[in-house]
Interface confidence: low
């Protein structure tokens, strides 16, 4: 039988009546155009909805937008378009929502061609009131909030000026001209690239990287010959043109650009790219594109300084610069990432790592699934996950994989079971242990979301026909109940729930179509009465994460420590609640070779935990570039994995000596850096 339809499934009592009492319809008085939805703050219940409708006239496009506000998680909406003077809002800038619970919102308005500058509407009270402000420039990008201070905003203008506001957009100052890209760093620092000779495109590879730590009073040039730059965790990366040819290399800084080191990564040519796939304060995953139009590259993982890199995964699927990659951080379990590789026969296969890129394996075949036509051996195959690439290829995949930090161990994704990703209609699979084991959860493609920290999973079938049924599960996808939320089916466009998966409300968005008109409609369902009581201690059970061999006392050790979690029992139907905090107990492990990456010049042969010297480097001195000086590395081939907390046990020797020689890096050395003040 299909998942959730066997006798073992206990039904949730009287759920139809309970849900009917908690289903709220709102019909928007709008012609169907586009709709965008933003949550304002955390646990505030405030949602802003912007609907826009374009009427293409012969000479110009006439636009109309409406703004709606809810303060009860979408159950009721109020038209507040008059608060923004019925102005047409530019949807390409979206709604700029302030960080944390600042309650700040910036909307960018469309203005007529001849105006001196743009116009914004600002709110700092969760969109209860808005202030109109005329800008002294036309914005090119959405306003960017400083992560540290939501009163500080930056924006680029259409004329490549860098503009900063210190009072939440009330007053603006142009702090630099000829700017290509600007980003907030930590401590209200702004990093930006500038061009000298004409345009960002023309000067690509000859840009300068600047920094201001005082919102434009003074500046420091921290890099030259820059192609691009990026921030990840505590790392600042710059790709820098080589002196002699058109190749470029990655340089990295951990001190805001004061000193730089050349990353031990391959250089790339004009048609190639680097991409930071993921970064935290410990390390970074870097994709390096392969030469030629291959559609793949190599993933490297960094050491704790972002300088020495280990090859993590070959033939990693990543189509083009800014293209598609399936690389996914599984946020529900530490150390887990999923991505796709392009195999020799051009089929796409899913790989998973449980130890932050140390090792990659195929996903275990779900026990309740058969191998499909892609499998050579009908008894041996793997699960392959559909993610961004499948979506971009217009396969029947409505959603990317889903995981939430507070729904420990749960991963939901579309997939197929075989030797590679199949173009056939996928099913939905769930893992409750962070990707180690999988079960088919739903037949066919669905939209899905997690509520109440995993206490409820909601799904809606992906269909071209109008729908009126929602499915929900209170036991992590084992058993499903269906609820008809309206008599009149709607064309479904999306599920919306508050980010963070703590809410018990879900909004179903869609439109109704009649002979003459179509209108936006939302149904918000509150599941609070399904989960009638608060969870108690007895509703939770102890779960050891990453457990693969319970008889091993190092079982569960990943990155030097194991974690035991209190997890909701599948059989418990109760509320985790909005204040639910994941309870975990860490325990440090003794060090083994698994806690060490292979050092620069070493690699791990397949299925071996020992690091051996790269044949091409055997007998050579290992020298690399650190802070602009050449270093000599004395190593027996191992270095501790960033973030690894193991203690005791094995302890390979590693020593770095300063060779007191300048590196052959063409990058700006510290003594050449200059500063200036405004």
């Amino acid at each position: 039988s299909a998942p959730g339809e066997d006798e073992e499934c206990g039904r949730v009592r009287d759920f139809v009546a309970k849900l009917a009492n908690n289903t709220h319809q709102h019909v928007f008085d709008d012609l169907r155009g586009s709709v965008s939805l933003s949550w304002v703050g955390d646990s505030t219940g405030v949602i802003l909805v912007l609907t826009t409708f374009h009427v293409p006239l012969v000479i110009m496009t006439f636009g109309q937008s409406k703004l709606y506000r809810s303060e009860d998680y979408g159950k009721n909406f109020k038209d507040i378009t008059d608060l923004i003077n019925n102005t047409f809002i530019r949807t390409e800038f979206g709604m700029a929502i302030g960080p944390e619970n600042s309650g700040k919102v910036v909307l960018t308005a469309e203005v007529s061609g001849g105006s001196r500058g743009g116009r914004i509407f600002r709110s700092s009270d969760f969109a209860k009131n808005f202030v109109q402000t005329d800008l002294p420039f036309h914005p090119l990008t959405q306003m960017m909030y400083s992560p540290q201070n939501s009163d500080y905003l930056l924006a680029l203008s259409t004329e490549n000026g860098l503009w900063v506001s210190k009072n939440f957009g009330g007053k603006w100052e142009e702090i630099h001209k000829a700017v290509c890209l600007a980003k907030w760093g930590s401590d209200n620092t702004i990093f930006f690239t500038t061009y000298a000779n004409g345009s960002c495109k023309a000067d690509l590879g000859a840009l300068e990287l600047w920094r201001t730590s005082d919102l434009g009073k003074s500046f420091k040039t921290i890099g030259v010959k820059i192609y691009s730059f990026g921030l990840g965790g505590r790392f600042l990366f710059a790709s820098v043109m080589a002196d002699k040819d058109t190749t470029r290399r990655i340089h990295v800084s951990t001190d805001q650009g004061d000193t730089w080191s050349m990353a031990q990564l391959p250089s790339v040519g004009q048609e190639q790219f680097y991409s930071i796939l993921a970064a935290n304060d410990d390390m970074v995953f870097m994709h390096v594109d392969e030469p030629g139009d291959t559609g793949f590259g190599t993933i490297f993982t960094s050491d704790d300084r972002g300088i020495v890199y280990s090859k993590s995964l070959d033939r990693h699927l990543y189509t083009t610069t800014g293209g598609e990659t399936d690389f996914t951080n599984v946020t529900s379990l530490r150390g887990v990432y999923i991505t796709s590789v392009l195999s020799e026969d051009n089929s796409i296969q899913t790989m998973i790592t449980f130890d932050q890129g140390g090792r990659w394996t195929h996903l275990r075949k779900p026990e309740n699934s058969e191998c499909d036509a892609t499998a050579k051996n009908k008894n041996e195959c793997s699960l392959h996950i559909h993610a961004s690439y499948s979506i971009s290829q217009k396969l029947n995949v409505p959603m990317a994989p889903l995981s939430e930090p507070n729904a420990v161990g749960i991963v939901i994704a579309h997939g197929s079971v075989g030797d590679a990703i199949s173009v056939m209609v996928p099913d939905v699979y769930i893992s409750d242990d962070g990707g180690y084991s999988w079960t088919k959860m739903l037949e066919g493609p669905h939209y899905y979301t997690i509520l109440d920290s995993g206490g409820i999973i909601v799904a809606i079938e992906h269909s071209s026909r109008p729908i009126n049924v929602i499915k929900f599960s209170t036991d992590e996808g084992q058993c499903w109940q269906t609820y008809t939320f309206t008599r009149d089916p709607i064309y479904f466009t999306g599920l919306a729930s508050e980010p963070g998966a703590r809410s018990m409300n879900i909004s179903i968005w869609g439109f109704t179509e009649s002979f003459l008109t179509s209108q936006w409609v939302s149904y918000t369902i509150d599941f609070k009465d399904i989960l009638e009581r608060n969870c108690e201690e007895k509703d939770y059970t102890i779960w050891l994460a990453h457990s693969t061999d319970p008889e091993d006392y190092e079982d569960g050790c990943i990155l030097g420590y194991k974690e035991q979690f209190l997890r909701l029992r599948k059989s418990s139907v109760c509320q985790n609640g909005r204040d639910y905090v994941v309870t975990k107990q860490p325990s440090i492990c003794l060090c083994s070779l698994e806690d060490f990456l292979c050092d620069f010049g070493y690699y791990r042969p397949e299925n071996d935990s020992k690091c051996v010297e790269q044949p091409e480097l055997k007998g050579h001195d290992l020298e690399f570039c650190l802070y602009g000086r050449e270093e000599h590395l004395t190593t027996n081939g191992y270095r501790k994995i960033p973030g690894d907390k193991c203690q005791g046990g094995v302890n390979p020797v590693r020593e770095v000596k300063d060779l007191k020689k300048k590196c052959t890096s063409n990058f700006l050395s510290p003594e050449k850096q200059n500063s200036k003040s405004n």
Epitope: L544, S547, Y553, C557, Y561, Q585, S587, I588, L590, Q647
Partner: antibody, heavy 129, light 107 residues
């Protein structure tokens, strides 16, 4: 050489608390867990709990839960076991023992248990009114 | 918790003879078992770990066997210093538990 030296004998009244120390030397203190085991007069060995010297995480036998607290001071390589609400049946010799296990809470343990290989000399605690 | 049962409670053996001590677990403990020797007024001493591996400095006359729920400690030829109480201990699942002990006395 590797050794565990415990604090001296204690006489306590019922309802009081006792805190026994165990100082480790001759090995890296944070590389091994420490278990506490007690033995009542003429009785067998009874495991009380375990502490991980690195993070200080603990796991206690259900019988002692709520009454026992195990702590450590990495600066002096010392672990402590405090037992509160003492009763006459707590009269026993209390041992600390170096334990290689990787247990946390009540989770699964070793494929290849190495045993409590180093023991303290024992601390006699007498509870009497 | 896992209950460890030792038998016999007392074993009377003459010096030079073979002694066989038994330990049974209420559920499988795999090979996660240790044996200890304790003499009066002394702390226990580790003899065997991993069910069958002798600890450092333990004479070859001591051997351990078994796996799962049934374990045996064998002393092939008893010496005078071997008369003591012997305990088995499991470390398969917390809490660790000891058997009640077997006293090996001189016959």
């Amino acid at each position: 050489q590797v050794q565990l030296v415990q604090s001296g004998a204690e006489v306590k009244k019922p309802g009081a608390s006792v805190k026994v120390s165990c100082k480790a030397s001759g090995y890296t203190f944070t590389s091994r867990y420490m278990s506490w085991v007690r033995q009542a007069p003429g009785q067998g060995l009874e495991w009380m709990g375990i502490i991980n010297p690195v993070g200080g995480s603990t796991s206690y036998a259900q019988k002692f839960q709520g009454r026992v607290t195990m702590t450590r001071d990495t600066s002096t390589s010392t672990v402590y076991m405090e037992l509160s609400s003492l009763r006459s049946e707590d009269t026993a010799v209390y041992y600390c023992a170096r334990d290689p296990s990787g247990i946390a809470l009540a989770g699964p343990a070793s494929r290849y248990y190495l045993g409590m290989d180093v023991w303290g000399q024992g601390t006699t605690v007498t509870v009497s009114s | 918790e896992i209950v460890m049962t030792q038998s016999p409670a007392t074993l009377s053996v003459s010096p030079g003879e073979r002694a066989t001590l038994s330990c049974r677990a209420s559920q499988s403990v795999s090979s996660n078992l240790a044996w200890y020797q304790q003499k009066p007024g002394q702390a226990p001493r580790l003899l065997i770990y991993g069910a069958s591996t002798r600890a450092t400095g333990i004479p070859a006359r001591f051997s351990g066997s078994g796996s799962g729920t049934e374990f045996t400690l064998t002393i092939s030829s008893l010496q005078s210093e071997d008369f003591a109480v012997y305990y088995c201990q499991q470390a398969r699942l917390g809490p660790w538990t000891f058997g009640g002990g077997t006293k090996v006395e001189i016959k």
